[in-house]
């Protein structure tokens, strides 16, 4: 029997501050770049090595990012988002959905003594 | 894991035109960036050209107006027409790919923008 997969969903503020090459990440998403389907959302693709978002720590490829300074990042155009990102100043806060995978068990299958249900 | 093959290399004469293909993997294709480097022998990499998901196009003065990127999202595929070669275009021709938009200034000509790396064709110019 199959396990199915199921997806943790948390939010959390970040507070980056733009080192000498930037925030050091890249993007994809936006209404004209749908990277998820049916969500134009803004989605992290890379973190470069060394950049400010690295040497931080938190932020993860895969996040979702849902605002900027308090900006909401829904709806835009990927080149609107892009330049929100580089015209956000030297502190940003972003506002970030992490999604983790979390593979559960068989379905239906409980071990004896298991603590849950 | 983003593999990027190039091919279209070879031998031409001065004056001459190639194009260079390179095929890429992966679902999201039309959201990277693409370059392309070349190296010629006891040189350090070079920057050729650059397009943007938007097609959005970048080049070395040393070949502007006689090369051509060009992207086909449909094939996965990016492009380098080279036209009025000479014998100095002569190098191995290389790939780079990364995926999505920097949110930082974009600077086409570092090779640390672009984080996949194609393993190269090469074009000699006689």
């Known amino acids: 029997m199959n396990g199915r997969v199921d997806y943790l969903v948390t939010e959390e503020e970040i507070n980056l501050t733009r080192g000498p090459s930037g925030l050091g990440f890249n993007i994809v998403g936006g209404t004209d770049q749908q990277y998820v389907s049916n969500d134009s959302g803004i989605y992290v693709s890379r973190i470069k090595e060394n950049g400010a978002a690295a040497l931080d720590g938190r932020l993860q490829e895969g996040d979702k990012i849902l605002s900027v300074n308090g900006q909401d990042l829904k709806n835009l155009l990927h080149q609107d988002a892009v330049d929100l990102f580089r015209n956000a100043g030297y502190a940003v806060s972003l506002r970030v959905q992490h999604r983790l995978q979390v593979q559960n068990g068989p379905i239906g299958h409980r071990g004896e003594g298991d603590p849950s249900g | 894991q983003v593999q990027l093959v190039e091919s279209g290399g070879g031998l031409v004469q001065a004056g001459g035109s190639l194009r260079l293909s390179c095929a890429a993997s992966g679902r999201t294709f039309s959201t990277y960036t693409l370059g392309w480097f070349r190296q010629a022998p006891g040189k350090e990499r070079e920057f050729v050209a650059a397009?943007?998901?938007?097609?959005?196009?970048y080049y070395a003065d040393s070949v502007k107006g006689r090369f051509t990127i060009s992207r086909d999202n449909a094939k996965n595929t990016v492009y380098l027409q080279m036209n009025s070669l000479k014998p100095e275009d002569t190098a191995v021709y290389y790939c780079a790919a990364v995926i999505g938009s920097t949110v930082d200034t974009y600077n086409p000509g570092d090779p640390l923008e672009y984080d996949y790396w194609g393993q190269g064709t090469q074009v000699t110019v006689s």
């Open positions: 397009i943007t998901w938007s097609s959005g196009t």
